[in-house]
């Protein structure tokens, strides 16, 4: 059974998580961002289904593809350059999902551009946060 | 309504330039890019460029590179195109197009092209 | 330079539907978008993001993509449907835009 401890730990990264999936958003869905209609030509694969930490497997499946449309964006956008941010993103997803778990992603039917995956992936952040809390 | 309204028709020599000119209302001008696409007689659309209305941003087709220049005047809403070194193949009717980003609640799509020029015939000939 | 390829031609009868393909290698990762063309006159959308309709685009055109191929299709084509059909998408990197060659659709 998890620990206090565990808990704890585990909001926390679902916490950082989601800062860093939020800056990301904010730095690209900007009218300053001159990149922004050519980074919604790049389309995501959005999970089936998304309410447990092992479903965090789809998301490291699409961090490469996150980081090629994030270097088409300026770096003052970001903290961070995109090698770096979808680097700390990766290692917060494999302490998540557990690395030693071998799951296979199913992906809807539906693509999406990067603003809906985003959304997306924040809204599986809130929604694990609110039933640790 | 949205309207892009272009300039008239332009007859050149091979060797010369011409600008062609896009004037936009009907909408917040610098809050969309332009694109300019050309059609050369009986053939399909070929894609030339793109102009950041916002902070004149600039991304030009391999093929034109060097030859083509575009930019906006924010205080007329004006966007304009420069081709210069015209040859033969140039000629074409040229058109602008307004490009840029829509929302549908928590979606954001690109939408290229949704509203067009009537388009500007240049005829390049000796 | 990145393609995009169309077949250059399609016929068919009214009320048939017509499907109109288009192949690009960054296809899997990148939307496609239609226009149609009337003769003597400035393209319209028809399809952006692979599959949605904007406004005031009739229900019988649709739009699918799979792999490296994008599809329109036009459910029950009319008369008024015949025009030169084309495919955009932008390379993998995203910053160099291209139109496929067009098709043209013939109604009769």
């Known amino acids: 059974a998890p620990t206090s401890s565990s808990t704890k730990k585990t909001q926390l990264q679902l916490e950082h998580l989601l800062l860093d999936l939020q800056m990301i958003l904010n730095g690209i869905n900007n009218y300053k961002n001159p990149k922004l209609t050519r980074m919604l030509t790049f389309k995501f694969y959005m999970p089936k289904k998304a309410t447990e930490l092992k479903h965090l497997q789809c998301l490291e499946e699409e961090l490469k593809p996150l980081e090629e449309v994030l270097n088409l964006a300026q770096s003052k956008n970001f903290h961070l350059r995109p090698r770096d941010l979808i680097s700390n993103i990766n290692v917060i997803v494999l302490e998540l999902k557990g690395s030693e778990t071998t799951f296979m992603c199913e992906y809807a039917d539906e693509t999406a551009t990067i603003v809906e995956f985003l959304n997306r992936w924040i809204t599986f952040c809130q929604s694990i946060i609110s039933t640790l809390t | 309504q949205v309207q892009l309204v272009q300039s008239g028709a332009e007859v050149k020599k091979p060797g010369a330039s011409v600008k062609v000119s896009c004037k936009a209302s009907?909408?917040?001008?610098?809050?969309?890019?332009i694109s300019w696409v050309r059609q050369a007689p009986g053939q399909g659309l070929e894609w030339m460029g793109w102009i950041s209305a916002y902070n004149g941003n600039t991304n030009y087709a391999q093929k034109l590179q060097g030859r083509v220049t575009m930019t906006t005047d924010t205080s007329t809403s004006t966007a304009y195109m420069e081709l210069r070194s015209l040859r033969s193949d140039d000629t074409a009717v040229y058109y602008c197009?307004?490009?840029?980003?829509?929302?549908?609640?928590?979606?954001?799509?690109?939408?290229?092209?949704?509203?067009w020029g009537q388009g500007t015939l240049v005829t390049v000939s000796s | 330079s990145y393609e995009l390829t169309q077949p250059p031609s399609v016929s068919v009868s009214p009320g048939q539907t017509a499907r109109i393909t288009c192949s690009g290698d960054a296809l899997p990762r990148k939307f496609a978008y239609w226009y149609q063309q009337k003769s003597g006159q400035a393209p319209v959308m028809v399809i952006y993001?692979?599959?949605k309709r904007p406004p005031g685009i009739p229900e019988r055109f649709s739009g699918s993509s799979s792999g490296t191929m994008a599809t329109l299709t036009i459910t029950g084509a009319q008369v008024e449907d015949e025009a030169d059909y084309y495919c955009?998408?932008?390379?993998?990197?995203?910053?160099?835009?291209?139109f496929g060659g067009g098709t043209k659709l013939t109604v009769l």
């Open positions: 955009y998408s932008t390379d993998s990197g995203g910053d160099v835009s291209v």
């Open positions: 009907g909408y917040t001008f610098t809050s969309y890019g």
């Open positions: 993001g692979d599959s």
């Open positions: 197009a307004r490009e840029g980003a829509i929302y549908y609640d928590s979606s954001g799509y690109y939408f290229p092209f949704d509203y």
